[in-house]
């Protein structure tokens, strides 16, 4: 560590004083301390010298010895004292600039350590300190406002009692700048944009920052905008608003557009789309199938999207058949909007009853025309099943009656027993009928198939079932003769259980 | 031994706010006093101010109107923000470590600032 | 309008020693210590001398300075042709209270 010579913390000397400061290092060393008037510097060897022959109030500081080649980077300081009877303060800034929450040291320097006790701060033209200004002083440093605020940016003086009566420094301007998180905060209005050539056509601009040094600007398709810029502050904050209007837009205005700002914290760009269009336009879609097929008792959502521009003038839902006259309540009917020209609308059809199978149509109006997109909603039903004994041609047989959608398929068991469904271990034989005839096939409705099982004797104590199943589910009928020599007697004869 | 390195746009409009940052590497920002000197093309050097880490400044009083100076330690760096430039103001900027008889040592590069529209 | 004022261009021949003059006032280098400074073509400025004849660690002593009442001196002895380069005074200023730069010398190596 250098070593100062005179070896004391602190000197006090008269103006016009000769001043001589020695710092001896083990290598070369150099002094610092505030930029100021009358010092002469000059190296010897291992040591510099710090002098002046005419010591002012302007000498007043500390200062500080390094050996810059010292990886410890040790120092030592000594601080110096003209003491001036006129002048009390030796201020070394015109100006302070901190970030908020940060402390403002105020660099007054007192020039004679007796003055400490009967020092204040107080603001230009006798003003008092704004409240909770929490502050402190050092008579080697000055005041320090501690955590500053951007209202506390005002001009200070500081003052020392001498004989009786107040004696004021030059002012120091304080700066407390607002922290700059981050670049400015953008919007660009709106976010997309569609017009028919020869419409006209806003789009703003707009960044804001809690300072005020920051640049803006608006370009197209690469290519800066000259637009005049409108400038505010509120909210604590600085605005910078560009507004583009164009009477009557055409096919080159069309493109990006993208709104740029930046300051020292760097840079943040929005983009939007600007799209010129001959006519209106009016477009349907949907993600889902139009054709779709559902369980009866479930619930199902109709999603259309609509892209238009301009707005829709009027939409709606109808159901079109073909069971009933009645509409889809409008309180079903959902429309969300996901942007400017996109739409979506929503049909809830909860619990879907048999009578609500059929088409559903999704109407929409703008300039450009109408426009439909019609849904086929066909309701799914697991089989039901009945079984009849009769005579076909002399031979009797059992019919299966089988009916729900999508076609069911038909299986035949015969198991031994008295039974309402037959298991494994009782079957005796099974038939397949790969081609039951289809007895009606109408759209939206069931599907009703029918098959045939030709039996020459019903043997008594044995089960008949019918077995019919589709992808929603199976159902079965079982039955069973009561009599032997059942084959001789008219059907009627015969208790069948479902 | 202390490096500077000044970064900030080379062109900048009339009326508009010229912004340089000056980097200190190989060396600590705290406890020295940092300026901006100035130098337009075929001129002679100007010095526009100084400013202490504690956030203490001086500045040139033909500029004082237009200076702002700021440092922010954690970064090692300090900067400098010009008002309302004018042609007048293009030169080449170079910012250094002012020692205590006021000289200047060591210095940055220098960026050149060219004001026009 | 410079505050010091230096003649705007010097010359000498290789070997040669050449002096670059510095005027002021009572105010900057009648009160206040002179500093010197090079700068070489198309570079930043280097500190020559400081403290009227300081050099720091480095620079030639080919390179001197001197001071008396309110004018200073550049003497560079030896000349080369490296030395060929624009030399600025500067000097403190009660006035200003802060650093005042001369117009600069134009050094040409014959």
């Known amino acids: 560590i250098p070593v100062i010579e005179p070896s004391v913390p602190e000197l006090v000397v008269k103006p016009g004083a000769t001043v001589t400061l020695r710092c001896v290092g083990n290598g070369s060393v150099e002094w610092d301390g505030p930029p100021s008037p009358h010092w002469t510097l000059y190296s010897d060897g291992s040591s510099s010298i710090l002098s002046t022959n005419n010591a002012t109030f302007q000498n007043t500081g500390t200062y500080r010895c390094t050996e810059p080649g010292d990886p410890l980077g040790g120092s030592a300081a000594i601080h110096l004292y003209v003491k001036d009877p006129a002048r009390p303060w030796n201020v070394l800034a015109q100006e302070v600039v901190v970030f908020e929450d940060q402390d403002a040291l105020l660099p007054c320097l007192l020039t004679d350590p007796v003055l400490e006790a009967g020092v204040s701060l107080v603001r230009v033209r006798g003003r008092p300190l704004m409240r909770h200004t929490n502050y402190s002083f050092s008579p080697w440093h000055g005041f320090t406002i501690h955590r500053a605020k951007f209202i506390q940016s005002q001009d200070y003086q500081c003052s020392a009692l001498m004989g009786g009566r107040k004696v004021m420094s030059i002012s120091i301007r304080l700066k407390v700048q607002k922290v700059i998180p981050g670049p400015p905060a953008l919007t660009l209005v709106p976010a997309e944009l569609v017009r028919i050539r020869g419409e006209a056509a806003q789009i703003v601009c707009s960044a804001s920052s809690v300072d005020v040094n920051f640049d803006v600007f608006l370009q197209h398709n690469n290519t800066k905008l000259a637009i005049p810029q409108q400038s505010d502050f509120h909210n604590n904050r600085y605005q910078k608003v560009l507004t583009l209007n164009l009477d009557q837009v055409d096919f080159q205005h069309a493109g990006n557009y993208s709104c740029v700002a930046s300051n020292v914290q760097g840079k943040h760009s929005t983009s939007m789309f600007f799209r010129v269009v001959e006519s209106a336009y009016l477009n349907l879609s949907s993600e889902q199938n139009l054709i779709q097929e559902v369980t009866v008792g479930e619930g199902l959502n109709l999603k259309v999207m609509v892209e238009a521009y301009p707005g829709l003038q009027g939409f709606n839902w109808t159901y079109l058949g073909p069971f009933s006259d009645h509409q889809p309540e409008p309180k079903l009917a959902n429309a969300t909007t996901k942007d400017t020209y996109r739409h979506t609308f929503t049909l809830s059809l909860p619990r879907l009853k048999p009578s609500e199978a059929g088409r559903y149509s999704f109407l929409a109006r703008n300039p450009g025309g109408w426009r439909a997109l019609t849904f086929e909603l066909t309701l799914r039903y697991p089989p039901e099943v009945s079984v009849i004994w009769t005579f076909i041609n002399g031979s009797g047989t059992l019919l299966c009656a089988a009916s729900g959608y999508p076609q069911p398929n038909v299986t035949w068991l015969q198991c031994s027993g008295h039974t309402d469904r037959c298991d494994e271990a009782q079957v005796l034989q099974v038939w397949d009928d790969p081609y039951p005839e289809v007895l009606s096939q109408e759209p939206f409705h069931k599907v009703t198939v029918q098959s045939l099982l030709t039996v020459e004797t019903l043997e008594h104590n044995q089960t008949y079932e019918c077995r019919a199943h589709n992808s929603v589910g199976s159902g079965s009928w079982a039955f069973i003769p009561i009599s032997a020599g059942a084959h001789t007697h008219p059907p009627d004869e015969f208790l069948f259980t479902p | 031994q202390v490096q500077l390195q000044e970064s900030g746009p080379g062109l900048v409009k009339p009326s508009e706010t010229l912004s340089l940052t000056c980097t200190v590497s190989d060396g600590s920002i705290s406890s020295y006093y940092w300026s901006w000197i100035r130098q337009p093309a075929g001129k002679g050097l100007e010095w526009i101010g100084r400013?202490?880490?504690?956030?203490?400044?001086n500045y040139n009083p033909s500029l004082k109107s237009r200076v702002t100076m700021s440092v922010d330690t954690s970064k090692n760096q300090f900067s400098l923000k010009l008002t309302s430039v004018t042609a007048a103001d293009t030169a080449v900027y170079y910012c250094?470590?002012?020692?205590?008889?006021?000289?200047?040592?060591?210095w940055g590069q220098g960026t050149l600032v060219t004001v026009s529209s | 309008q410079s505050v010091l004022t230096q003649p705007p261009s010097a010359s000498g021949t290789p070997g040669q020693r050449v002096t670059i003059s510095c005027s002021g006032s009572?105010?900057?280098?009648?009160?206040?210590?002179v500093n010197w400074y090079q700068q070489l073509p198309g570079t930043a400025p280097k500190l020559l001398i400081y403290?009227?004849?300081q050099r720091p660690s480095g620079v030639p002593d080919r390179f001197s300075g001197s001071k008396s009442g309110t004018s200073a001196s550049l003497a560079i002895s030896g000349l080369q042709s490296e030395d060929e380069a624009d030399y600025y005074c500067a000097a403190w200023d009660d006035s200003l209270n802060g650093p005042v730069f001369g117009g600069g010398t134009k050094l040409t190596v014959l």
């Open positions: 009572s105010s900057n280098i009648g009160s206040n210590t």
């Open positions: 403290s009227n004849n």
């Open positions: 400013i202490y880490t504690s956030g203490s400044t």
């Open positions: 250094a470590r002012e020692r205590i008889t006021s000289f200047f040592d060591p």
